[in-house]
């Protein structure tokens, strides 16, 4: 049978290297040697490249080197087929060789911010050295912080005659390191070059961009003053880098501003111990280049009462986060505090927070938060300077089955009866949210039966029971991602009541 | 900036061989095609051959085809001309000479400052 | 192979003088013609090439024009630096030929 038709063919011109044609072959089931043949010089000269290779993916391409490459140029590529059954030829294709000319990538050799100019970073680099005079080139310009997996692109061109080969790339962050790549392409190419070696630069450091403030309020002392525990961090969007070399926190009660009190600390929180009105606490960090912008907090005097708008609140595990929503009453509120720290029997020493706006959701990657470990979750919503009164909940970012079984006891054993008590599992061997409880129960040599309770229940009376006959009993707590069983116990039923 | 620079003066016997250098600087040596050009002493000038240094492939005048050897050495971006089977008309000042136009081809843009190869008994 | 007749073998001129050298190939080679001017002593220097661009540097004075199988080289207005020896080359294809050349003198 003759050879299948060449099909797809397809053509780079690899600047100064040669001229690659490829195509798809078909199905050859006998040896097919191709021949390329080749128009070029404006249509004046032609000449013809043959495969060589015993291969057959080897034999879908052929190559034109220089000097018989020339750039303008355009050509028309035919792909002849012949095995011993005959000839076939492609279809004619035309090539405009800037279109398909794919050059080396330029070399990055310096990144670097320039004197005074914020957020800014220049980048420098050296031209293809194999790229055509004659063209200009178009540049891509790729960009991430060091520890972020997604790039930003720009593009830009550059005059053939500009000897300037540098980009100001603008509206960065600051202090913050840069990873820079550049890849180019000759202006009417469709082909780009390979991206340049990765170099990293870092934009200049400023003062402080702000902070985000919070608080914890503790139970009135004796004295009828209030202990706050103050916290803070650097506001969402600072650089990972920023510096702070100090902060400079004023509180004065709402009613009287003379009566201001000022403290600096390098601690990222502080104890303040207030009366019990209303104040205002202000704050600002600073490093060698100034400082940030005041954050400032309202603390509700101790008896005042706070809105309350949260309805209902749930968490749920989806998709390796965490998901915390809730419905609210208040159409005005839009901003919330989320408050976490894990349910220990202990003063909750990591309390993290974080706030959330425009939504009445909250997520946090599982892997932020410890497996197995119960942890509590109170949204505060916020209205201007008001805080509310918070919802709170328990999550698990991901259950496990208990570690260990209810601890069971026997009770008021009768002829045919018996209660059987069970002692809720500590939070630290729980693994998750126990959400039944399974009494397993079987008379000696008997049939096994079971009863499954919600997990408020912590006793459950056995009725039916044979009298003077042994028993074995023991309870499963369960978590949605299984049970595990306490230590089984033995029981008799008497032969009769006091009551018989 | 493009550079090339040949090899010294040679005195050689009528059927001895010559072997020329050239190297290359100040960009990339497998991205041009490099020449060889002969001039004898008041006479014009004779295209001998080239060499594809990215592919090795050669093209040679057939007027020298079986005398004549280009070879290329990546390495040292350097380029070789070797004449065997010398004979007295063969003393010629010899250059080499990269092409330099993507839109013209076998033109020679940069010379080398040639070498003086002198064959006599 | 293609043969490249240059005319005339030499010339005198004087500084300011329009002076026109012409090179005919032996048959149709399109526009691939290159001109080289050499100074005694000195490696040739490519002028002009694809029968009329000028080389990278190359003074405004010199130009190429012709097509097809003549060609022709031009020096607007001769200067002291350009007393030299010229040569018209074919790059139309392998193997490469030069013309004879063309010696100009100074009157």
């Known amino acids: 049978a003759l050879p299948a038709k060449p099909e797809n063919i397809s053509c780079v011109y690899y600047y100064r290297k040669n001229l690659t044609c490829t195509w798809s072959p078909g199905k050859e089931t006998s040896y097919t040697q191709y021949t390329v043949k080749r128009t070029y010089a404006f249509g004046e000269k032609h000449d013809n490249c043959t495969t060589n290779s015993s291969t057959s993916e080897n034999r879908a391409s052929c190559s034109f080197f220089l000097p018989r490459i020339t750039i303008p140029d355009n050509y028309t590529i035919e792909v002849e087929a012949e095995n011993g059954d005959g000839v076939i030829k492609s279809h004619m294709t035309y090539w405009r060789l800037e279109n398909i000319a794919k050059t080396e990538p330029p070399k990055i050799f310096r990144v670097k911010p320039v004197l005074g100019i914020k957020r800014m970073i220049q980048i420098e680099w050296i031209k293809p050295e194999l790229a055509p005079v004659s063209s200009d080139l178009k540049y891509t310009l790729r960009f991430r912080t060091v520890n972020s997996t997604s790039w930003m692109e720009v593009n830009f061109a550059k005059n053939r005659k500009d000897k300037n080969q540098t980009y100001n790339l603008t509206g960065l962050q600051p202090f913050t390191e840069y990873v820079i790549a550049l890849r180019c392409a000759v202006k009417e190419s469709k082909f780009w070059s390979d991206w340049s070696q990765e170099k990293m630069g870092m934009t200049e450091e400023e003062a402080p961009c702000g902070l985000e403030l919070w608080r914890v309020l503790k139970p009135a002392e004796a004295d009828g003053r209030r202990p706050v525990r103050l916290l803070w961090k650097k506001a969402r969007g600072a650089p990972v880098l920023e510096k702070t070399l100090g902060y400079n926190i004023w509180y004065y009660p709402e009613s009287n501003t003379n009566l201001t009190e000022t403290m600096n600390t390098t601690n990222q929180q502080l104890e303040l111990h207030l009366g019990g009105e209303s104040f205002w606490v202000s704050m600002i960090s600073y490093n060698s280049l100034g400082k940030s912008p005041v954050a400032t907090l309202r603390i509700p005097a101790i008896q005042e009462k706070s809105f309350q708008c949260i309805e209902v609140m749930q968490a749920c595990v989806a998709e390796d986060q965490l998901v915390v929503k809730w419905q609210s009453s208040a159409l005005d509120v839009n901003t919330w505090m989320i408050e976490w720290f894990p349910d220990v029997d202990s003063e909750p020493t990591t309390l993290s927070w974080e706030s959330v706006s425009q939504a009445t959701n909250w997520t946090i990657q599982q892997d932020k938060l410890k497996p197995f470990w119960c942890y509590n979750i109170s949204v505060y919503p916020m209205l201007h300077d008001k805080v509310g009164e918070p919802y709170s909940i328990q999550a698990y970012a991901k259950e496990g089955v208990p570690s260990e079984g209810p601890e069971t006891k026997v009770e008021n054993i009768g002829v045919k009866t018996v209660t059987i008590t069970w002692k809720e599992i500590p939070k630290s061997e729980r693994k998750g949210i126990i959400c039944n409880y399974t009494i397993f129960y079987q008379a000696e040599g008997g049939k096994g039966f079971s009863k499954t309770v919600n997990s408020s229940i912590l006793q459950y009376g056995l009725e039916s029971l044979k009298r003077k006959t042994s028993y074995i009993v023991q309870v499963m707590a369960s978590t949605s991602a299984g049970g595990t069983n306490g230590t089984s116990i033995n029981f008799k039923t008497l032969s009769f009541s006091v009551f018989e | 900036q493009v550079q090339l620079v040949q090899s010294g003066a040679e005195v050689k016997k009528p059927g001895a061989s010559v072997k020329v250098s050239c190297k290359a600087s100040g960009y990339t040596f497998t991205g041009y095609i490099m020449n060889w050009v002969r001039q004898a002493p008041g006479q014009g000038l004779e295209w001998m051959g080239l060499?594809?240094?990215?592919?090795?492939?050669?093209d040679y005048n057939p007027q020298f085809q079986d005398r004549v050897t280009i070879t290329a050495d990546e390495s040292t971006s350097t380029a070789y001309m070797e004449l065997s089977s010398l004979r007295s008309e063969d003393t010629a000042v010899y250059y080499c000479?990269?092409?330099?136009?993507?839109?013209?081809?076998?033109?020679?843009?940069?010379w080398g400052q040639g070498t003086l190869v002198t064959v006599s008994s | 192979d293609i043969q490249m007749t240059q005319s005339p073998s030499s010339l005198s001129a004087s500084v300011g003088d329009r002076v026109t050298i012409t090179c005919q190939a032996s048959e149709d080679i399109y526009s691939f013609v290159a001109w080289y001017q050499q100074k005694p002593g000195k490696a040739p220097k490519l002028l002009i090439y694809?029968?009329?661009t000028e080389a990278q540097g190359v003074p405004s004075r010199f130009s190429g024009s012709g097509s097809g199988t003549d060609f022709t080289l031009t020096i607007s207005s001769l200067q002291p630096e350009d007393f030299a020896t010229y040569y018209c080359?074919?790059?139309?294809?392998?193997?490469?030929?030069f013309g004879g050349g063309t010696k100009v003198e100074i009157k």
């Open positions: 694809n029968a009329q």
């Open positions: 000479a990269r092409d330099g136009y993507d839109d013209g081809p076998y033109t020679l843009e940069t």
């Open positions: 060499i594809n240094p990215y592919n090795g492939g050669t």
């Open positions: 080359q074919h790059h139309y294809d392998s193997p490469l030929t």
